[in-house]
């Protein structure tokens, strides 16, 4: 009588998460009577996967009808595979008894589960930085298997090289995670820029997953200030304008000071947007030139995006002709009281 053999023909089987796996097992003899059981893993801690003798295993079915004794096929289907199902599965023949006696095990079939990585999530710095500074972006993706994965960074379509990537865990696992940090040097033109994290994996059939982040969330372009004056039709008035250029984001508070004293505060509105995504704004004052006694210094002070204020001063220039137009008795504030104190445009 030939010795019973338990044959598991495949050393390994690979399936994609969500699909079914077929694990094949045949025996060369039906003698002696006794059950076949499937286990994941070997040794005392092995996990019972299916017992043809008894039990309820909702995800496991036999390939052939187990009541047909002469088929000698004990192959099983496992449905809805997840990464947690990965491992080596053993088909084991027992002799009926109390307890059942293990007679022979198959060589085992390693089930590897191909699981797609999750959509990459890109997160940027918590605080904005200014051009010429370096900011870090982090990309994370989880739940993939096998471990081999490729991650690339792009800025506006150009591949970046300054990044560091880790895949965890380092050892064998049912699924893996990737985390990559890229360093990006900001420029003044980056308001409209985008960084892309691209993940390629065997499960994606050449169609990589992408996560994006906008540099507009990470950049602060500080404004440049320019203060100048222009004469008005009324000979005793001049327009003093503060031009605030090329700033981002929009949040901006402007204060006019007359010889160091606050005269007017405005919040930026009706901004004009530049092609590069930055903004311009201007604020102006109507100044009564007859009200001067000494030299008047007007200061435009700008607080941008909660940063320390920057300012630009302008010494009011009054021509001899304008001085002549003023009567000797005229006195009062520098800023024309009959006109709005300021304007913007």
């Amino acid at each position: 009588e030939e010795e019973l053999q338990v044959i598991q023909p495949e050393k390994s089987v690979s399936v994609t998460a969500g699909e079914s796996a077929t694990l094949n097992c045949t025996v060369t003899s039906l003698i002696p009577v006794g059950p076949i059981q499937w286990f994941r893993g070997a040794g005392p801690g092995r996990e019972l996967i299916y017992n043809l003798k008894e039990g309820h295993f909702p995800r496991v079915t036999t390939v052939l009808d187990p009541t047909k004794r002469n088929n000698m096929d004990f192959s099983i289907h496992i449905s809805n595979i997840t990464p947690a199902d990965a491992g080596t599965y053993y088909c084991v023949k027992f002799r009926k008894g109390s307890p059942d006696v293990e007679l022979k095990s198959g060589a085992g079939t390693e089930l590897s589960v191909r699981a797609k990585p999750s959509a990459p999530v890109v997160s940027g710095p918590t605080a904005r930085a200014t051009p010429e500074h370096t900011v870090s972006f982090t990309c994370e993706s989880h739940g993939f298997s096998p471990r081999d994965i490729t991650l690339k960074w792009f800025k506006n379509g150009n591949e970046l090289s300054d990044f560091q990537t880790n895949v965890d865990p380092a050892g064998k696992s049912v699924s893996y995670s990737i985390r990559s940090t890229a360093r990006v040097v900001l420029t003044r033109r980056d308001v409209h820029s985008q960084v892309i994290c691209e993940v390629a994996h065997v499960t994606l059939q050449g169609d990589p997953l992408r996560g994006t982040a906008n540099l507009s969330e990470a950049i602060r372009v500080p404004p440049t200030l320019e203060v100048f004056q222009r004469p008005m039709r009324a000979e005793n008035q001049v327009n003093v304008t503060c031009q605030v250029r090329k700033f981002y984001p929009q949040r901006l508070l402007l204060t006019w000071l007359e010889n160091g004293n606050v005269s007017q505060t405005e919040t930026a509105s009706t901004l004009t947007e530049n092609k590069d995504g930055t903004y311009n704004w201007r604020s102006w004052l109507l100044v009564n030139t007859c009200a001067h006694r000494d030299g008047v210094v007007l200061t435009c002070q700008v607080e941008h995006d909660g940063q320390p204020a920057v300012s630009k001063s302008h010494a009011l220039e009054v021509s001899a002709h304008q001085k002549e137009q003023c009567s000797d008795t005229t006195s009062g504030p520098v800023l024309a009281p009959t006109a709005p104190l300021g304007g913007s445009g």
Epitope: V33, K53, E54, P66, R69, G97, S98
Partner: antibody, heavy 118, light 107 residues
Framework: EVQLVESGGGLVQPGGSLRLSCAAS????????MHWVRQATGKGLEWVSA???????YYTGSVKGRFTISRENAKNSLYLQMNSLRAGDTAVYYC????????????WGQGTMVTVSS | DIQMTQSPSSLSASVGDRVTITCRAS??????LAWFQQKPGKAPKSLIY???SLHSGVPSKFSGSGSGTDFTLTISSLQPEDFATYYC?????????FGQGTKLEIK
């Protein structure tokens, strides 16, 4: 349809012989362990004999040496040769198929009556 | 030989009742225990194998449990066709042996 049909029962004198047959249909008899079970009138069930797929045979103590179980694959039939019959062997004899993995009884014949009496 | 002891030997119950029959083995039989139903003048019918698995076509009102030496058969809601004699059987080793039977009668 899976079916077992016994025949060969009857009245026999003590010390006499009888051969019971069981014709199987709907399955291959040689692929299963097969059994004979008996039941005396008004009594419980008693396992009598079995034959395994390899031809190995088993008997309950009271019939050892007197009964012989066998099968004929070509006829898909099971037999029980009963010799040296005693009054205590009087019973309905059932042919039973053993289940696939563990030999749990699954299919029963309708039974044939054996009466041992002078 | 392994002795199988059933209790009670007889049981009176009404339609709709839930009844439990117990079976004890004289030694550990793992879960190689079967239950059979027999009506007068008929061949036994296989109900349960490996202590708790229902044979094909057996209604789910029948359930079995136990392992080792102590086993039970439960019928959840008795119907007129369930009044019969029930036998347990060990089939872990030869000679296979049956319990003496439990006769379930209408009250």
């Amino acid at each position: 349809e899976v079916q077992l049909v016994e025949s060969g029962g009857g009245l026999v004198q003590p010390g006499g012989s009888l051969r019971l047959s069981c014709a199987a249909s709907g399955f291959t008899l040689s692929s299963y362990d097969m059994h004979w079970v008996r039941q005396a009138t008004g009594k419980g069930l008693e396992w009598v004999s079995a034959i395994g797929t390899a031809g190995d045979t088993y008997y309950t103590g009271s019939v050892k040496g007197r009964f012989t179980i066998s099968r004929e694959n070509a006829k898909n039939s099971l037999y029980l040769q009963m010799n040296s019959l005693r009054a205590g062997d009087t019973a309905v004899y059932y042919c039973v198929r053993g289940g696939v993995w563990d030999d749990a009884f699954d299919i029963w014949g309708q039974g044939t009556m054996v009466t041992v009496s002078s | 030989d392994i002795q199988m002891t059933q209790s009670p030997s007889s049981l009176s119950a009404s339609v709709g009742d839930r009844v439990t029959i117990t079976c004890r083995a004289s030694q550990d039989i793992n879960n190689y225990l079967a239950w059979f139903q027999q009506k007068p003048g008929k061949a036994p019918k296989s109900l349960i194998y490996t202590a708790s698995s229902l044979h094909s076509g057996v209604p789910s009102k029948f359930s079995g449990s136990g392992s080792g030496t102590d086993f039970t058969l439960t019928i959840s809601s008795l119907q007129p066709e369930d009044f019969a004699t029930y036998y347990c059987q060990q089939y872990v080793s030869y000679p296979y042996t049956f319990g003496q039977g439990t006769k379930l009668e209408i009250k």
